[in-house]
Interface confidence: medium
């Protein structure tokens, strides 16, 4: 069986949430049982599509209703003919979407006015991904390339932070991290060094 992917580009880029049909042309064989393979594993997908072009020419489709990042990979199709498996050329499927967070800011407990760091990282495709930091509803830094570390000089009350990741497909917002104040024992040196009526918030540095 001469097996080839029909008309499809070797690299296929699809937006997240969109449908896609990968197609595979089998010539020189009647009624082939076409199996699709992704990254070396047979795709168990009953919901496929077939078109008989002629007696010895079939087109098989792998129909994905709504692609997500996990659908990205290398696909090919195969048929068995006389005990031998014929394998097609692969299609590389890339799934593009809004950025996906690999690191999000975590909740912290810090002493009043103590410096701390928050981290944020997001990936595409598409790249590049840039990060913007928010303190509550106020934008406090960015845009800067992902990954990003926010250096905060200190807070005097519980404060919420989040990051926003941008790429050509749009933006995604991270979880909101709450930075709580650690209770400081009355007799501690920390208590004597800090005046509770003085706001120690200074505009944080924003670094990659």
């Amino acid at each position: 069986a001469g097996l080839k992917l029909m008309g499809a580009p070797v690299k296929l880029t699809v937006s997240q949430g969109q449908p896609v049909k990968l197609n595979c042309s089998v010539e020189g064989m009647e009624e082939p049982d076409i199996q699709w393979v992704k990254d070396g594993a047979v795709v168990q997908n009953l919901d496929q599509l077939y078109i008989p072009v002629s007696e010895q020419h079939w087109i098989g489709f792998l129909s994905l209703k709504s692609v997500e990042r996990s659908d990205a990979g290398r696909y090919w199709c195969q048929v068995e003919d006389g005990g031998e498996t014929e394998i097609s050329q692969p299609v590389w499927l890339t799934v593009e979407g809004v950025p996906f967070f690999t690191v999000e800011p975590k909740d912290l407990a810090v002493p009043p006015n103590a410096p701390f760091q928050l981290s944020c990282e997001a990936v595409g495709p598409p790249e590049p991904v840039t990060i913007v930091w928010w303190r509550g509803t106020t934008k406090i830094g960015g845009p800067a390339p992902s990954p990003s570390v926010l250096n905060v000089t200190g807070v005097t009350q519980s404060t919420m932070f989040s990051c926003e990741a941008h790429n050509l497909k749009g933006l995604a917002s991270s979880r909101t991290a709450t930075v709580h104040l650690q209770l400081v024992p009355r007799g501690s040196s920390a208590h004597h060094h800090h005046h509770h009526h003085h706001s120690a918030w200074s505009h944080p540095q924003f670094e990659k």
């Epitope: 009647e30 009624e31 049982d33 168990q44 009953l46 919901d47 496929q48 077939y50 709504s66 068995e80």
Partner: antibody, heavy 125, light 108 residues
Framework: EVQLVQSGADVKKPGASLTISCQAS????????ISWVRQKPGKGLEWMGR????????YYGPSFQGHVTISADRSTATAYLQWRSLEASDTAMYYC??????????????????WGPGTLVTVSS | SYELTQPPSVSVSPGQTARITCSGD??????AYWYQQKSGQAPVLVIY???KRASGIPERFSGSSSGTMATLTISGAQVEDEADYYC???????????FGGGTKLTVL
């Protein structure tokens, strides 16, 4: 005209073996798939499994895996559903279905357009 | 194992719009199909691939899908539409089919 002729009703005792058949005509057998669907008396439809056009690929629902075997004979255009050991809970109507319908987009296997009349299997001691 | 959930029954008056829902975690990724079964008969395909009407099915039947919910809508239900309706889809891994429990549509 597409026709699926199923074997007649059968009464068996628990533990007995049974094979029911579904003979297709009016189309090229190897252009389509065959699925089997169970319907217990007064109950809903249950997908049992499907066999590919060549018979080289079979899929089974989790409730039926290991309990039934689906096979096909291309030379006689017949699909089979087989039990090695029947249970009382197997009492039901069994439909064979030609899986695959021609649509504007092509042939879709899950397009169950042609159904057999059903075979009633009763398992009782 | 994977399940599709349907309401057991829906009742409408003739001419009204009937909506039958089907929920399943994989429906954002897998197509829904709808089958009609009248008493004592084999099922008939009504809708395939979420919203496409099967051949010979009247225009009053339509389908839609959003998130984990698929919906069969019968606009202007008629007495002859009284039947059991089953949604069908495929497991998240794509390796077996599943019917919903069925919805008995009564057109009073």
């Amino acid at each position: 005209e597409v026709q699926l002729v199923q074997s007649g009703a059968d009464v068996k005792k628990p533990g007995a073996s049974l094979t029911i058949s579904c003979q297709a005509s009016g189309y090229t057998f190897t252009d389509y798939w065959i699925s089997w669907v169970r319907q217990k008396p007064g109950k809903g439809l249950e997908w049992m499994g499907r066999i590919s056009r060549h018979g080289s690929q079979t899929y089974y629902g989790p409730s039926f895996q290991g309990h039934v075997t689906i096979s096909a004979d291309r030379s006689t255009a017949t699909a089979y559903l087989q039990w090695r050991s029947l249970e009382a809970s197997d009492t039901a109507m069994y439909y064979c279905v030609r899986a695959g319908g021609q649509t504007s987009g092509g042939t879709i296997p899950e397009y169950y357009q042609h159904w057999g009349p059903g075979t009633l299997v009763t398992v009782s001691s | 194992s994977y399940e599709l959930t349907q309401p057991p029954s829906v009742s409408v008056s003739p001419g009204q719009t009937a909506r039958i829902t089907c929920s399943g975690d994989a429906l954002p990724k897998k197509y829904a199909y709808w089958y009609q079964q009248k008493s004592g008969q084999a099922p008939v395909l009504v809708i395939y691939e979420d919203h496409k009407r099967a051949s010979g099915i009247p225009e009053r039947f339509s389908g839609s899908s959003s998130g984990t919910m698929a919906t069969l809508t019968i606009s202007g239900a008629q007495v002859e539409d009284e039947a059991d309706y089953y949604c069908y889809s495929i497991s998240p891994a794509g390796n077996y089919g599943v019917f919903g429990g069925g919805t008995k549509l009564t057109v009073l």
